[in-house]
C-alpha cells in the first residue's frame, strides 16, 4: 500500500562528530534518521521510539539503552527507558529531552528514532451516542454462526465484556497502556470509557449484531476514556499479542486495530513484523476524508485496511469530514449507524458509525474465513476478501477527482458459501505511490510475499510517461513505471495473483529496428504469457500503429511500438492457462475496456499502441482499462485509435484439487 | 472447571433480612455477570435480576421494589444477593447462575420465611 | 415483559418415545432462547442455548429449533433419566422471563 518514501515528515540528523567513549561507530555512510509525525497536533514530543537495525538482540537493545542514559547525564540531562522492545522490532521507548536526538541517533545500531505520536478511535461521535431502544426489532439481518476457531484482538478502549451480547466471548487481558486523558476537570465515566471497545466487540462476535458470532475475543486497553492513545503504546500491545502467540500458539489470530495516528514509519514496520508471523491485521482507513496513506497503520501494506460506506453502498460523511479513501484501502464495510452492545447498560444497544465499525465488519468476516479455512495465508484471506466484495457499487463522485481511479470500489460482503472458493485463480490490482513530477522519476508497486506479479502497466493523468517493465528487486519482480519529461507523474500497476507453484520470468525484446514493431513471446515450453509491458527512453513515441491482431497459432506474444521495449510476463503453473481477448475501438475514445469472461481472470491488461496519447491501462476486478487523452484537446483521429488488450488466465489444477476436495 | 457455590439455607421470621452468597471459580469473573433465580416451592424460575462483576451496574426485576440489593466483590469472585423485610411468599430456593445465558448454575440456597 | 408460554405443561411418555415441547414468546425473541432441564431438588441444567445450539456435554438426542416466536425442544428417544421439568427461558430483553415449565412423566 504505502511506498518506502511513504508521506510522513523525516529529519536526518547527520553525523556530525565522533562520539565521545563510543566502542561501536556506526558503520561507515549510513546515517540513522530521525522521524516524526506530520501532523503537528498529533506529536507528543519527549518520548521517542528508538528503533535498533534488525538483528540487534535484546542484550544489545538494554546495552544501547544503557548507553544513552550513561551519555545523557554526562550532559546533565535526565531520561528514561519506559520499555524495551523485543519480539516484533529491536529498540526501545525513552522519555528524554530533544535536546539529546543527535547523540541518540549516533549510538550503535540505531535504524531511526521516531517521536511518539497520538492514535485516535475512528468511530464518530464514539462516546456521544445516540441511544437506541434496549432492543432493536423484528427482521434484522442475522448471519450464520461462524469464527469458533478464531481468536481476534481487539485494540482499543477498556470494554464491558460481560455486556449481555458479549457476555463470556471476550477475554479482557491484563494489558493497559492509555495516556491520561486530556483536561484537569475529566471525570472517568466508565460507561463512557469502555463506549468504542465494546460496541465493536459486538460488531464482530455479537450474539445479536456480531458478523463472527463464534469468534472469541481478547482485548488490549490501548485508548484511553477519550478514544485517545498513543503509537508507542498500540506498538507495545501488538509485541504483547506476538508474545503471547509464541507462548501459546493457538489457532489463526487476527487484530483489529480500530484507530488511526500520523504517518508512523515504526508502527507499520511493526505490523508487517505481525503480519509475516501469521497474524490477520484489520484497520480503520481513518475518518478524515483524506488519503488514507497518511495514517497509520491504514498506510502498512501488510494491513487489510477498511473505508467505510453506508447502506446504499455510498462512502460515509461524518459531519464536515467522512471515511479516507485512496490506493492504502483495500475494501469498504458498512460503517454509517451501526448498531451494536451501548455500555450504557448491560442490556442497551446504539449505533456509531466510522471506519472502526467496517473495520470491525471485515475482522468479522475474516474470522469466519479462517473458521473454514483454517490454513489461509494472509495474501489468500485478503485476495478472497476482494473476490467476495460487491464490485462497482460506490459512487466515486464522492472521492477527489486525482483518487478514484486508485479507490478500491469493494464493498466487503460475507462468501456465499466459507468453502469451495479453492478453484479460483486469485487476482487483485496494487497501485504504487505517485512518482513525483521530475524527468527520471519512477514509481515502484509490489505484491505480497506470497503473491506473483503477474503483470505491470503504468498510468499518467497527463500522458506523459515511458512505460513500465518488470524487474527483480530483492529476489522478487516489481513493476517499475516512468515519468517523461514534462510529466506531472507516473502510477505503477501491479497485478499480483495467487498461483501456487509458479515459476515466472520476464522475457524481454530491445525496440525493433523494423517498422513492424517490436514482439516478445514466451518460448519456454509450458510457460504462458500472462502479462505485457512495454518501456520507451524516447520522450513522445510517434503514432506508428503496430498490426493489434497476433497472427494465428501465437498468443503467447506481446506487440509493441517500435521504439519501445517490450517485457512479456511468462509463467509455468500446473494446469495454467491464458488466452489473449482484445478490444480495439476505431474512433477516438477516452476509456476502451475488454473484461474476461466468467471463470477466467484478468491477469494482464496493456494499451495498443502505446502512443504518447494514451494515459495507460490498469486492471479493475475483471476489466482491462485503457484509458486515453481527452480526444478534444488532442485534435487528432489518426491516433484515436485505440485497444485494449486483456489476458485472461484459470488453472485447471486449481479447479481439480477443489473438485477433489470435495 | 465452572463453579458457582453458594452458602448454606437460612430460616427466617417476616420483615427480616437475607443475604445470600454466591463465590465463582474456574472462569474470568468480569466476563459474565450474575443473574439471581428463585423457585417457590412447587412453583416456575422466576428472574430477580442481574449483577456485574465488572462495574457493578444491576438489572432489577420490578416485582422487588426496591427489597432486594445486589452486589460483587471481585476480588473474592463474590456475588450476594440481600432482600429486606422478607414476607412468607419470599420463602423459596435462591440460585446465582452465571451471565443472562445462565449457562451455569450454584446448587441452590433455600430461604424460609417462617413466623 | 415478555410472555413465555409453554406446552403442554405436562406429559406421559414411555422410554424410547420421541418427545416435543413448544414454546412461544409474546413477541420476536430472534433466537435467544435457552432450555433447562431440572430434576427435583436440584438446580437447573442448561441444554440448549441460542434456539438450537446444544450445550457441551449434552446428549445428541436433545435438539432445539425455531427462531422469532415460536420454539421447539426435542428428545429423539427418551431415556429413563431424562424424566424431568424443562423450562424454555427468553434473554432478548430484561426482565429475562421463563416458561412455566413442562413436566414430562413416565406413563
Known amino acids: 500500500q504505502e511506498d518506502e518514501d511513504g508521506d510522513y515528515e523525516e529529519l536526518v540528523l547527520a553525523l556530525r562528530s565522533e562520539e565521545d567513549g563510543l566502542a561501536e561507530a556506526p558503520e561507515h555512510g549510513t546515517t540513522a534518521t530521525f522521524h516524526r509525525c506530520a501532523k503537528d497536533p498529533w506529536r507528543l514530543p519527549g518520548t521517542y521510539v528508538v528503533v535498533l537495525k534488525e538483528e540487534t538482540h535484546l542484550s544489545q537493545s538494554e546495552r544501547t539503552a544503557r548507553r544513552l542514559q550513561a551519555q545523557a547525564a554526562r550532559r546533565g540531562y535526565l531520561t528514561k527507558i519506559l520499555h524495551v522492545f523485543h519480539g516484533l522490532l529491536p529498540g526501545f521507548l525513552v522519555k528524554m529531552s530533544g535536546d539529546l536526538l543527535e547523540l541518540a541517533l549516533k549510538l550503535p545500531h540505531v535504524d531511526y528514532i521516531e517521536e511518539d505520536s497520538s492514535v485516535f478511535a475512528q468511530s464518530i461521535p464514539w462516546n456521544l451516542e445516540r441511544i437506541t431502544p434496549p432492543r432493536y426489532r423484528a427482521d434484522e439481518y442475522q448471519p450464520p454462526d461462524g469464527g469458533s476457531l478464531v481468536e481476534v484482538y481487539l485494540l482499543d478502549t477498556s470494554i464491558q465484556s460481560d455486556h449481555r451480547e458479549i457476555e463470556g466471548r471476550v477475554m479482557v487481558t491484563d494489558f493497559e497502556n492509555v495516556p491520561e486523558e486530556d483536561g484537569t476537570r475529566f471525570h472517568r465515566q466508565a460507561s463512557k470509557c469502555d463506549s468504542h471497545g465494546t460496541h465493536l466487540a459486538g460488531v464482530v462476535s455479537g450474539r445479536d449484531a456480531g458478523v463472527a458470532k463464534g469468534a472469541s475475543m481478547r482485548s488490549l486497553r490501548v485508548l484511553n476514556c477519550q478514544g485517545k492513545g498513543t503509537v508507542s503504546g498500540t506498538l507495545i500491545g501488538l509485541e504483547f499479542i506476538r508474545k503471547s502467540q509464541l507462548v501459546q500458539p493457538v489457532g489463526p489470530l487476527v487484530v483489529l486495530l480500530p484507530l488511526a495516528g500520523g504517518y508512523s514509519r515504526v508502527l507499520n514496520a511493526a505490523c508487517q513484523r505481525l503480519a509475516r508471523a501469521g497474524v490477520v491485521l484489520v484497520t480503520a482507513a481513518g475518518n478524515f476524508r483524506d488519503d488514507a496513506c497518511l495514517y497509520s497503520p491504514a498506510s502498512a501494506p501488510e494491513v487489510i485496511t477498511v473505508g467505510a460506506t453506508n447502506a446504499q453502498d455510498q462512502p460515509v460523511t461524518l459531519g464536515t469530514l467522512g471515511t479516507n479513501f485512496g490506493r492504502c484501502v483495500d475494501l469498504f464495510a458498512p460503517g454509517e449507524d451501526i448498531i451494536g452492545a451501548s455500555s450504557d447498560c448491560s442490556t442497551c444497544f446504539v449505533s456509531q458509525s466510522g471506519t472502526s465499525q467496517a473495520a470491525a465488519h471485515v475482522a468479522g468476516i475474516a474470522a469466519m474465513m479462517l473458521s473454514a479455512e483454517p490454513e489461509l495465508t494472509l495474501a489468500e484471506l485478503r485476495q478472497r476478501l476482494i473476490h467476495f466484495s460487491a464490485k462497482d457499487v460506490i459512487n466515486e463522485a464522492w472521492f477527489p477527482e486525482d483518487q478514484r481511479v486508485l479507490t478500491p470500489n469493494l464493498v466487503a460482503a460475507l462468501p456465499p458459501s466459507t468453502h469451495g472458493a479453492g478453484w479460483q485463480l486469485f487476482c487483485r490490482t496494487v497501485w504504487s505511490a505517485h512518482s513525483g513530477p521530475t524527468r527520471m522519476a519512477t514509481a515502484v508497486a509490489r505484491c505480497a510475499p506470497d503473491e506473483e506479479l503477474l503483470s505491470c502497466s503504468s498510468f499518467s493523468r497527463s500522458g506523459k510517461r515511458r512505460g513500465e517493465r518488470m524487474e527483480a528487486q530483492g529476489g522478487k519482480l516489481v513493476c517499475r513505471a516512468h515519468n517523461a519529461f514534462g510529466g506531472e507523474g507516473v502510477y505503477a500497476i501491479a497485478r499480483c495473483c495467487l498461483l501456487p507453484q509458479a515459476n515466472c520470468s520476464v522475457h524481454t525484446a530491445p525496440p525493433a529496428e523494423a517498422s513492424m514493431g517490436t514482439r516478445v513471446h514466451c518460448h519456454q515450453q509450458g510457460h504462458v504469457l500472462t502479462g505485457c509491458s512495454s518501456h520507451w527512453e524516447v520522450e513522445d513515441l510517434g503514432t506508428h500503429k503496430p498490426p493489434v491482431l497476433r497472427p494465428r497459432g501465437q498468443p503467447n506474444q506481446c506487440v509493441g511500438h517500435r521504439e519501445a521495449s517490450i517485457h512479456a510476463s511468462c509463467c509455468h503453473a500446473p494446469g495454467l492457462e491464458c488466452k489473449v481477448k482484445e478490444h480495439g475501438i476505431p474512433a477516438p475514445q477516452e476509456q476502451v475496456t475488454v473484461a474476461c469472461e466468467e471463470g477466467w481472470t484478468l491477469t494482464g491488461c496493456s494499451a495498443l499502441p502505446g502512443t504518447s496519447h494514451v494515459l495507460g491501462a490498469y486492471a479493475v476486478d475483471n476489466t482491462c482499462v485503457v484509458r486515453s487523452r481527452d480526444v478534444s484537446t488532442t485534435g487528432s483521429t489518426s491516433e484515436g485509435a485505440v485497444t485494449a488488450v486483456a489476458i485472461c488466465c484459470r488453472s485447471r489444477h486449481l479447479a481439480q484439487a477443489s473438485q477433489e476436495l470435495q | 472447571q465452572v463453579q458457582l457455590v453458594q452458602s448454606g439455607a437460612e430460616v427466617k421470621k417476616p420483615g427480616a433480612s437475607v443475604k445470600v452468597s454466591c463465590k465463582a471459580s474456574?472462569?474470568?469473573?468480569?466476563?459474565?455477570?450474575i443473574s439471581w433465580v428463585r423457585q417457590a416451592p412447587g412453583q416456575g424460575l422466576e428472574w430477580m435480576g442481574w449483577v456485574s462483576f465488572y462495574q457493578g451496574n444491576t438489572n432489577y426485576a420490578q416485582k422487588l421494589q426496591g427489597r432486594g440489593t445486589m452486589t460483587t466483590d471481585p476480588s473474592t469472585s463474590t456475588a450476594y444477593m440481600e432482600l429486606r423485610s422478607l414476607r412468607s411468599d419470599d420463602t423459596a430456593v435462591y440460585y446465582c447462575?452465571?451471565?443472562?445465558?445462565?449457562?451455569?448454575w450454584g446448587q441452590g440456597t433455600t430461604v424460609t420465611v417462617s413466623s | 415483559d415478555i410472555q413465555m408460554t409453554q406446552s403442554p405443561s405436562s406429559l406421559s411418555a414411555s422410554v424410547g418415545d420421541r418427545v416435543t415441547i413448544t414454546c412461544r414468546a409474546s413477541?420476536?425473541?430472534?433466537?435467544?432462547l435457552n432450555w433447562y432441564q431440572q430434576k427435583p431438588g436440584k438446580a437447573p441444567k442448561l441444554l440448549i442455548y441460542g434456539a438450537s445450539s446444544r450445550q457441551s456435554g449434552v446428549p445428541s438426542r436433545f435438539s432445539g429449533s425455531g427462531s422469532g416466536t415460536d420454539f421447539t425442544l426435542t428428545i429423539s428417544s427418551l431415556q429413563p433419566e431424562d424424566f424431568a421439568t424443562y423450562y424454555c427461558q427468553q434473554w432478548f430483553d430484561v426482565p429475562t422471563t421463563f416458561g412455566q415449565g413442562t413436566k414430562v412423566e413416565i406413563k
Open positions: 413477541q420476536n425473541i430472534n433466537s435467544w
Open positions: 474456574g472462569y474470568t469473573v468480569t466476563s459474565y455477570g
Open positions: 447462575a452465571r451471565g443472562f445465558g445462565m449457562d451455569r
